[in-house]
């Protein structure tokens, strides 16, 4: 899901910093300092070079741009705005570049941008208009098809006084710009919940990765609108049980494959419907690997092997009969 390049030959630039005053704009085919360029592969790689800003002299032919492993810190408005525009840039990988702030309009003037990877950046401040570029209620549609936001949660002491989930969702929903998004990866972000409106407003999604978060429940999440959804990754969360409404919605999606491994399933009476569903459904991949975590007597039991007699709940005693 990240930009890749062919094995075409790469030309390296001279090893000096591009900070000289220029009387004219860069030649369209020159390679920025500290980068490698292949015009044949339409690829520029500025990788692990401790760059503190996006090079100004990117060649106009660039289709795949790797800016990984740098120290960009802030991605300002128009970070990739050039004259002429980078009209061919389709895949942009900014992973692991110590970004902590992405400002409104950071990706403006990239008309062909299909893939964007911001993974492994501690994004304490992601503008609501980072992807839409406008504070209009309905923005011009973004060309983005894949948005990779794995492990973008900042350390706890660097987070703003607001919900991290809310900040990310605001950026995803602003101006309804991402209506064409097909792949969204949000793995490893310590998400405790999924705001209920997010999926309804991303109707084109084919692939959604929410693995390795801290999701406890999907009760308020609706998958009903995601009729094109093909894969839903929920592995390594804190899910205890999936309730009937969620099961029915997932079953109703025509192309779906769901991944549920490594969740702490609670095998009590509330699990009965899910077990019944698991035995019948084809949508869960590796369903034979799902095991109970609680209660203690059920630990490591395979969900598919349970029957209703196994799934009991301790009776709730009236207050007068409870002991301390």
């Amino acid at each position: 899901s990240s930009p890749t390049s062919s094995a075409s030959s790469f030309s390296s630039s001279a090893p000096f910093l591009a900070s000289a005053v220029s009387a004219q704009p860069p030649l369209p085919d020159q390679c920025p300092a500290l980068c490698e360029c292949s015009e044949a592969a339409r690829t520029v790689k500025c990788v692990n070079r401790n760059l503190t800003e996006v090079p100004t002299d990117l060649p106009a032919y660039v289709r795949n741009l790797f800016l990984t492993g740098n120290q960009l810190a802030v991605l300002p408005a128009g970070a990739f705005a050039r004259r002429p525009p980078l009209a061919e840039l389709a895949a942009l990988n900014l992973s692991g570049s110590r970004l902590d702030e992405v400002r409104a309009g950071a990706f403006e003037h990239l008309p062909s941008l299909r893939q964007l990877d911001l993974s492994h950046n501690p994004l304490a401040d992601l503008s609501p208009f980072a992807f839409s570029g406008s504070n209009a209620s309905v923005s011009a549609p973004s060309p983005l098809v894949e948005l990779i936001l794995n492990h973008i949660v900042p350390p706890e002491d660097e987070r703003q006084n607001r919900s991290f989930e809310g900040m990310v969702v605001a950026a995803l929903l602003a101006g309804r710009a991402l209506q064409g998004l097909r792949r969204l990866e949000l793995a490893s972000n310590h998400f405790l919940y999924l705001p209920r409106d997010v999926l309804a407003q991303l109707p084109s999604l084919r692939h959604l990765d929410l693995s390795n978060n801290s999701l406890v429940s999907l009760t308020y999440v609706s998958f009903r609108n995601l009729t094109h959804l093909e894969s839903l990754h929920l592995e390594d969360n804190a899910l205890k049980v999936l309730h009937n409404g969620t099961l029915a919605e997932l079953q109703g999606l025509p192309h779906i494959r769901v991944f549920l491994d490594n969740n702490p399933w609670v095998c009590d009476c509330h699990m009965a419907d899910m077990v019944t569903w698991l035995k019948e459904t084809e949508v869960v991949q590796g369903k034979d690997r799902l095991t109970c975590a609680y209660p203690e007597k059920m630990r490591n039991r395979v969900l598919l092997e349970l029957n209703s007699a196994d799934l009991d709940c301790d009776p709730i005693l009236p207050p007068s009969l409870q002991t301390s």
Epitope: A77, G78, R83, P111, A140
Partner: antibody
């Protein structure tokens, strides 16, 4: 309120030099690209050049790059245009201008009132 | 450099009628999402005023009787209905590449 105030124009002899200034106020000058545009009497607009916020990138129109130098002093909120070897065809009203966004300019929302340079012997 | 050919050089329009000004760049100045043409109005003794950016986006505070259209190498500024205060010179500008360039201008007068 954004304000741009050009100064330094006047009468100069052919071959002489002059430095125009543009004092900016009402915004964070150090964040914005700034631009010079000129207009000869009764003629159209001509883009002279631009300078980025930290002065690392300066672009000129090709025909003027050998005689004009654009600079800025962010501490003084001032943009400069240093003109040398001026000729009669440099007689014009000189405007400084600013875009509404803080990256390289595509268009100009804010303009000064201009300062007039007259080149004559 | 990109040359912007503006036409007509001048036109006279009756109050309430439509004024149409053309701007033709010497090469395409459009991507799939933006056209890098902008329109300005200049009245005597005043600096230019931005009317329209990116070919068709009306600048804040500009009356809705101004509109822009076009892509590639063919752009149009329309004013309808023309009002007395619209007497001015109109310029197009491209920001596709450096150097930025302006059209020669179109002078609009009232009949």
């Amino acid at each position: 309120e954004v304000k741009l105030l050009e100064s330094g124009g006047g009468l100069v002899q052919p071959g002489g030099s002059l430095k125009l200034s543009c004092a900016a106020s009402g915004f964070d000058f150090s964040r914005y690209w700034m631009t010079w545009v000129r207009q000869a009497p009764g003629k159209g607009l001509e883009w002279i050049g631009e300078i980025n916020p930290d002065s690392r990138t300066i672009n000129y129109t090709p025909s003027l790059k050998d005689k004009f130098i654009i600079s800025r002093d962010n501490a003084k909120n001032t943009l400069y245009l240093h003109m040398s070897k001026v000729r009669s065809e440099d007689t014009a009203l000189y405007y400084c201008a600013r875009p509404d966004h803080d990256y390289n300019p595509y268009y100009f929302n804010y303009w000064g009132q201009g300062t007039t340079l007259t080149v004559s012997s | 450099d990109i040359v912007l050919t503006q036409s007509p050089a001048s036109l006279a329009v009756s109050l309430g009628q439509r004024a149409t000004i053309s701007c033709r760049p010497s090469q395409s100045v459009s991507t799939s999402s933006n056209s890098y043409i902008h329109w300005y109005q200049q009245k005597p003794g005043q600096p230019p005023k931005l009317l329209i950016k990116y070919a068709s986006n009306l600048e804040s505070g500009v009356p809705a009787r101004f509109s822009g259209s076009g892509s590639g190498t063919d752009f149009t500024l329309n004013i309808h209905p023309v009002e007395e205060e619209d007497t001015a010179t109109y310029y197009c500008q491209q920001s596709w590449e450096i150097p930025l360039t302006f059209g020669a201008g179109t002078k609009l007068e009232l009949k």
